[in-house]
Interface confidence: low
């Protein structure tokens, strides 16, 4: 489909005659008539099997034609075509008198022909017009003409059908060809199809609106390559979806069991050693000096006692001092210049002379010690923590540092060993002499129930339409990873498609 | 301009047959792609049925698969349904419709359709 314009632009009849050489009068009040036809070689009257087109009275004599396409005027004159365009064609354009106003043919006399001009050839469809002048003996018309397209058809012969869109059945323009040009972020035979944001997985990302990435079940992330864990997973990831793998110093079926609580909370005070011994246990090895569970405790050099003869003990930065009582001098005061007669013992002690009065002992009463009986008796001598707990003197009380295994004030009860919960997977654990025993329940085997040994819940292949099956170790069923399409806890469903049209 | 013309519809008894045409014209018939398409009172649009521009490419839903048969006549600009062991529930206006591309996806023109009731 395509239209063949003509541009009349002059007319030249000097002497305002007619073809038969009679004058017009008052002068030629001139029309035009065209006839478009296929090509013949000599063009001869007949059908203009392409179209016609008559003009109004455009001049008087000689006149120049005025380009009237602007104002929706008749010049270019327009002869459309609904057919493939031949790349040839006839040409008749006559120049006529008209005495009145009545242009029909048959209103007109016979003679009132002015000039009539005949061409053919070849014209290949383009936006440039071809300027002509036919002369005759009494009359010359300079024109152009050209064949373009109608709206929405391209190609050489305008017969490719293309019209430009963006909406659901494709998002195009129109290459000069008629061949499709896709609209940014849209590709396809017809542009139907968004290009998703760039990095998105081919796989586990669609989209439905160009630059997105929408994620397929059991995918995360902007680009959809990020797999989602399995629900309840707290420290573990996944390599495909719905799985948990646990981080380094985690445990448990969902990656929430402590494995290492020394480096995620570093419990130990003062520079202490760390070790873990299961989950959510770790033991202190204290730097000199320091002491308690997580050596938190700061051992001063003086709860030793180092200072004799009731001397009093002074905490240093670098040690300790002892401040001597009157008649006794050393490190740690143990020199005495004092006798029996000087009455060094106290709390009731009795003075006993050595060395001829160049010494002396006291004999202290129970409950107190020391050599000037200055003292009272240290409580953990009497060893009171009991299954190897460590006694530590605390002032006027002591408390007992009890062995793992043991509890209590000194370390007299028995830690169950099964306080630690060390069976796994609901097993029942009982209490023995010298250790426990797990009773596991049914689909578990191992010392501590650790073995799995129930059959794989996939092994029936219960899931449908080529989908993913994942067994969940935490209740022994399965999970179905459906593909696109499909839905249902099996993927049994295909998901509706447009609820309209489905093709 | 598009035009869709509908014709065939009428009355036919369950099991019966009938052959429903689509008349084109206003563009150039081998360039889109033709379909069907029905509406049964008080119910969603239920696309039935779509050839491809050439011809090479059919489309079933699966309620008439291996009853209806549809096919093409570029001599006469025409799409043709054959309509096999029709049911009651076939009973509906069955409109032809293009999408205005080549391939069969979604509709752009129709027509005014035709009728088709199944009952005895």
């Known amino acids: 489909s395509g239209v063949f314009q003509l541009q009349l632009q002059e007319f030249i009849n000097e002497r305002g005659v007619l073809a038969s050489g009679r004058p017009c009068e008052p002068g030629c009040r001139t029309f035009f008539r065209v006839c478009l036809k296929h090509f013949q070689a000599v063009v001869s009257p007949g059908p203009c099997t392409f179209g016609t087109v008559s003009t109004p009275v455009l001049g008087t004599n000689s006149f120049a034609v005025r380009d009237d396409s602007s104002g929706g005027g008749r010049n270019p004159l327009q002869l459309p075509f609904n057919f493939t365009w031949p790349g040839t064609f006839s040409l008749i354009i006559e120049a006529w008198h008209a005495p009145g106003d009545d242009l029909r043919p048959e209103a007109l006399p016979p003679d009132a022909l002015i000039s009539k001009i005949a061409i053919q050839g070849s014209l290949a469809v383009g936006q440039n017009w071809l300027l002509d002048e036919q002369t005759s003996t009494l009359t010359r018309l300079r024109y152009s003409y050209r064949v373009i397209c109608s709206d929405n058809y391209y190609g050489d012969n305008c017969s490719r059908l293309c019209k430009k869109r963006n909406d659901h059945f494709g998002h195009y323009v129109c290459q000069p060809d008629g061949n499709l040009s896709c609209l940014p972020g849209w590709t396809g035979e017809y542009c139907q199809q968004p290009i998703c944001l760039s990095g998105c997985h081919e796989q586990n990302g669609y989209c439905s609106k160009p630059a997105e990435c929408l994620c397929r079940p059991g995918w995360q992330g902007r680009l959809c390559n990020e797999c989602i864990p399995h629900n309840g997973c707290r420290h573990g990831t996944c390599s495909t979806p719905w799985q948990c793998t646990c981080d380094e110093g985690w445990g448990g079926l969902f990656c929430d069991q402590d494995l290492n609580y020394c480096t995620h909370h570093s419990p130990c005070k003062n520079g202490a050693t760390c070790s873990n011994s299961g989950q959510r246990s770790y033991t202190c090895t204290c730097r000199p000096g320091y002491t308690g569970v997580d050596c938190e405790l700061e051992l001063s050099e003086c709860d030793s006692n180092p200072c004799r003869n009731g001397g009093s003990c002074k905490d240093q930065e670098d040690g300790y001092h002892c401040l001597c009582p009157p008649g006794y001098y050393g490190l740690h005061c143990e020199h005495s210049t004092l006798s029996c007669a000087d009455s060094p013992c106290f709390n009731g002690g009795s003075c006993r002379e050595r060395n001829q009065g160049a010494n002396y002992a006291c004999e202290c009463p129970p409950n107190f010690t020391g050599s000037n009986c200055e003292k009272k008796v240290d409580r953990c001598t009497s060893n009171p923590c009991a299954n190897g707990g460590q006694c530590l003197n605390r002032g006027p009380s002591r408390m007992c540092r009890c062995r793992p295994g043991f509890t209590g004030t000194y370390c007299e009860l028995h830690v169950s060993d099964c306080a630690r919960n060390p069976c796994a997977h609901g097993g029942t654990c009982h209490d023995l002499e010298n250790g426990l025993m797990c009773t596991c329940p049914a689909g578990f085997s191992g010392r501590r129930c650790e073995v799995r040994t129930s059959i794989d819940a996939c092994a029936s292949s219960p899931c449908f339409n080529r989908a993913t099956c994942y067994t969940d170790l935490s209740t022994d069923t399965f999970v179905c990873n459906c593909p696109y399409g499909f839905v249902g806890s099996r993927c049994e469903f295909p998901v509706g498609l447009p609820p309209s049209f489905p093709w | 301009e598009v035009q869709l013309v509908e014709s065939g519809g009428g009355l036919v008894q369950p099991g019966g047959s009938l052959r429903l045409s689509c008349t084109a014209s206003g563009f150039t018939f081998d360039v889109y792609a033709i379909g069907w398409f029905r509406q049964a009172p008080g119910k969603e649009p239920e696309g039935i049925s779509c050839?491809?521009?050439?011809?090479?490419?059919?489309y079933y839903a699966d309620s008439v698969k291996g009853r209806f048969t549809i096919s093409r006549d570029s001599a006469k600009n025409t799409v043709y349904l054959q309509m096999n062991s029709l049911k009651p529930e076939d009973t509906a206006v069955y409109y032809c419709?293009?999408?205005?591309?080549?391939?069969?996806?979604?509709?752009?023109?129709w027509g005014q359709g035709t009728q088709v009731t199944v009952s005895s």
């Open positions: 419709a293009t999408p205005g591309i080549a391939a069969c996806r979604g509709i752009h023109y």
């Open positions: 050839i491809s521009s050439s011809g090479s490419i059919t």
